[in-house]
């Protein structure tokens, strides 16, 4: 529907509260360095303007596009040039180029201070003093640090954040009530951000078709009883929603997501038997619940895939006349039968099937050429199965921390040019696959593990894209979205790497390490491990283990010492010397 005023349309659809929240998220995701107060001022100005348009859609400027209105507003920021440098040049462009320019300047790793959690009493006081500002600040801080966070989902997080404070600030033991809830929100938020970042990368780097293929596979696994036409409709709508959110069109995205949730709930009978509970919830909870809903049971009487996709005389004709529909049907039929496969594996199988048809259909005897196509799937299925089996065994043997360390060493040897903080962050997250997925039965391990690894490796890809240092990373990240994980798995030690010069400062530690949380202490040790491997890429597991054990003992000893700083200085020198000797540095 064409509306006289887009801004009035969205304001009316979303309501003032959601409108303001979404505009704040949009602005914070674009101008990540701007102070909170500046953003609030801009949001209030936009909201007041929207209200005038609701009152009279023919009022001046009300017919302008949201990109024009928001872009004009962002470009009024006085400090744009000194704060953002060349991003200010975006303001010289016209829409749609201006919005594209803003999108290109989104920073996945903004130079912002780490969010430090204040004392519980301080937070509760701030919450009670000004609840609205407190919650806006939450949206602002998350949005600017995660410029691709799925905006309607961030509203859901904010609702849970508010509920946590409302409940816990009245509790007898505020901290015991609140801190676990905040930890859970933080961890879920990071996971949600990373998952959405992969969706945006899929759309922006590999195009709409890549995203649609992913969505067909995932929704077919989730809704195996739904007809292909129904799944196709959901995929089209879901693609629109994510295209909008990834493109900064947050008001349209949130509005369309609500419409999609409404449609799904109105048509649950033809979609899935698992939606009933979700559909009884309020909007934000409903959308979240649908997005996370468990797979429905597979229909009992599904025929063999071979009939339609190998044995039929019309295979090649159907393929050539409508590849998107025919391959979409193949993916749908395969995925609904295989909830035990990862989405990326299903996409690899579909790609193999397509490649085989493209090769065979023009041949003299197409059927003879493609008759054994399903046999080609076997090694593709076995590769992730074997990898997951091996790594889960390793995880069970080592535990999470040591499993992360094994991955740190493995990945540092593969791509030693990558920055140490990125290697630590990515390897720690890769290592979490163990506790996240290895507990599952065989049938759930692969979709859990490989699709999670896709999300984590995308973090590596987006961080590396900002400052590219390794051709191998670039190659694995850009050649094929579905083969990223196999590409990284196949990388061997980089023999071209010239070891880093030894720098004693890198291995100098101070008493402040003793006051760190267990997690932060692990990160310090893992940072040292990466640096060790960069200095000595050919070091054996045994050598590295010996040095790391000595390091752990050194930290433990000095943290127990009366004069911690002296201990770290003196024992540290000895440790560095011993480590150099042990590694032959």
């Amino acid at each position: 529907d064409a509306h006289k005023s887009e801004v009035a349309h969205r304001f009316k659809d979303l309501g003032e509260e959601n409108f303001k929240a979404l505009v704040l998220i949009a602005f914070a995701q674009y101008l990540q360095q701007c102070p909170f107060e500046d953003h609030v001022k801009l949001v209030n100005e936009v909201t007041e303007f929207a209200k005038t348009c609701v009152a009279d859609e023919s009022a001046e400027n009300c017919d302008k596009s949201l990109h024009t209105l928001f872009g004009d507003k962002l470009c009024t920021v006085a400090t744009l040039r000194e704060t953002y440098g060349e991003m200010a040049d975006c303001c010289a462009k016209q829409e749609p180029e201006r919005n594209e320019c803003f999108l290109q300047h989104k920073d996945d790793n903004p130079n912002l201070p780490r969010l430090v959690r204040p004392e519980v009493d301080v937070m509760c006081t701030a919450f009670h003093d000004n609840e609205e500002t407190f919650l806006k600040k939450y949206l602002y801080e998350i949005a600017r640090r995660h410029p691709y966070f799925y905006a309607p989902e961030l509203l859901f997080f904010a609702k849970r954040y508010k509920a946590a404070f409302t409940e816990c600030c009245q509790a007898a033991d505020k901290a015991a009530c609140l801190l676990p809830k905040l930890d859970e929100l933080r961890d879920e938020g990071k996971a949600s951000s990373a998952k959405q970042r992969l969706k945006c990368a899929s759309l922006q780097k590999f195009g709409e078709r890549a995203f649609k293929a992913w969505a067909v596979a995932r929704l077919s696994q989730r809704f195996p009883k739904a007809e292909f036409a129904e799944v196709s409709k959901l995929v089209t709508d879901l693609t629109k929603v994510h295209t909008e959110c990834c493109h900064g069109d947050l008001l349209e995205c949130a509005d369309d997501r609500a419409d999609l949730a409404k449609y799904i709930c109105e048509n649950q009978d033809s979609i899935s038997s698992k939606l009933k509970e979700c559909c009884e919830k309020p909007l934000l909870e409903k959308s979240h619940c649908i997005a996370e809903v468990e797979n429905d049971e597979m229909p009992a009487d599904l025929p063999s895939l071979a009939a339609d996709f190998v044995e039929s005389k019309d295979v090649c004709k159907n393929y050539a006349e409508a590849k998107d529909v025919f391959l979409g049907m193949f993916l749908y039929e395969y995925a609904r039968r295989h909830p035990d496969y990862s989405v990326v594996l299903l996409l690899r199988l579909a790609k193999t099937y397509e490649t085989t048809l493209e090769k065979c259909c023009a041949a003299a005897d197409p059927h003879e050429c493609y008759a054994k196509v399903f046999d080609e799937f076997k090694p593709l299925v076995e590769e992730p199965q074997n990898l997951i089996k091996q790594n889960c065994e390793l995880f069970e043997q080592l535990g999470e921390y040591k499993f992360q360390n094994a991955l740190l060493v493995r990945y540092t040897k593969k791509v030693p040019q990558v920055s140490t903080p990125t290697l630590v962050e990515v390897s720690r997250n890769l290592g979490k696959v163990g506790s996240k997925c290895c507990k599952h039965p065989e049938a759930k391990r692969m979709p859990c593990a490989e699709d999670y690894l896709s999300v984590v490796l995308n973090q590596l890809c987006v961080l590396h894209e900002k400052t590219p240092v390794s051709d191998r990373v670039t190659k694995c990240c850009t050649e094929s979205l579905v083969n990223r994980r196999p590409c990284f798995s196949a990388l061997e030690v980089d023999e071209t790497y010239v070891p880093k010069e030894f720098n004693a400062e890198t291995f100098t530690f101070h008493a402040d390490i003793c006051t760190l949380s267990e997690k932060e202490r692990q990160i310090k040790k893992q940072t040292a491990l990466v640096e060790l491997v960069k200095h000595k890429p050919k070091a054996t597991k045994e050598q590295l283990k010996a040095v790391m054990d000595d390091f752990a003992a050194f930290v433990e000893k000095c943290c127990k010492a009366d004069d911690k700083e002296t201990c770290f200085a003196e024992e540290g020198k000895k440790l560095v010397a011993a480590s150099q000797a042990a590694l032959g540095l």
């Epitope: 078709r209 090649c316 050539a320 023009a362």
Partner: antibody
Framework: EVQLLESGGGLVQPGGSLRLSCAVS????????INWVRQAPGKGLEWIGI???????FYATWAKGRFTISRDNSKNTVYLQMNSLRAEDTAVYYC???????????????WGQGTLVTVSS | DIQMTQSPSSVSASVGDRVTITCQSS???????LSWYQQKPGKAPKLLIY???KLTSGVPSRFSGSGSGTDFTLTISSLQPEDFATYYC???????????FGGGTKVEIK
């Protein structure tokens, strides 16, 4: 040496029919897909259709109904039957082989020299 | 409707110049089903590039192709006398019946 050689072009009246031939030498035609492409004087290339090795045919939307592609593997020849010809069908008609290993991609590695068809009263 | 728009329609250049020809497709081509052809007057077209960036055997390395989705480019890094010709892009889509060529770009001597 592999060669594709078109023949059968010439002057034809509007509403008339014509059958073009594409004789292939140097390879066994039965293993390859052959396309017909045309080019009006001073204009660009226009894909007409394809016949796969198995004999399955596909046509550009505008060519469906008036144009028919067939093959005779024993003669190593592909044909283009054109009916209800119009002045705008005046062009050089080429036959071209699809690169082996592709079925639906626009990759044509071997071309004939072309035959001119003129539709005029 | 399928649209394959080539630009510029003609370009005047000198030997040694770098020449760039673009091809814009609507909708996007199927995967990277995009080819580039060279045609000289009175001759049949010659396949230069397939899958958007792969050089056909025997084609000089001064020719290169790039792009994906809807936007593609043919670059001649250093124009040689034998490169003066008309260049066409060809696109393959979800349906084979939509196979289309661009309008052509004539590379002329300045």
């Amino acid at each position: 040496e592999v060669q594709l050689l078109e023949s059968g072009g010439g002057l034809v009246q509007p509403g008339g029919s014509l059958r073009l031939s594409c004789a292939v030498s140097g390879i066994d035609l039965s293993n390859y897909a052959i396309n017909w492409v045309r080019q009006a004087p001073g204009k660009g290339l226009e894909w007409i259709g394809i016949i796969w090795a198995s004999g399955t045919t596909f046509y550009a939307t505008w060519a469906k109904g008036r144009f028919t592609i067939s093959r005779d593997n024993s003669k190593n020849t592909v044909y283009l039957q054109m009916n209800s010809l119009r002045a705008e069908d005046t062009a050089v008609y080429y036959c071209a082989r699809t690169v082996p290993g592709y079925s639906t991609a626009p990759y044509f590695d071997l071309w004939g020299q072309g035959t001119l068809v003129t539709v005029s009263s | 409707d399928i649209q394959m728009t080539q630009s510029p329609s003609s370009v005047s250049a000198s030997v040694g110049d770098r020449v760039t020809i673009t091809c814009q497709s609507s909708p996007s081509v199927w995967l990277n089903f995009l080819s580039w052809y060279q045609q000289k007057p009175g001759k049949a077209p010659k396949l230069l590039i397939y899958e958007a960036s792969k050089l056909t055997s025997g084609v000089p390395s001064r020719f290169s192709g790039s792009g994906s989705g809807t936007d593609f480019t043919l670059t001649i890094s250093s124009l040689q006398p034998e490169d003066f010709a008309t260049y066409y892009c060809g696109g393959g889509y979800s349906s084979i019946s939509d196979t289309t060529f661009g309008g052509g770009t004539k590379v002329e001597i300045k």
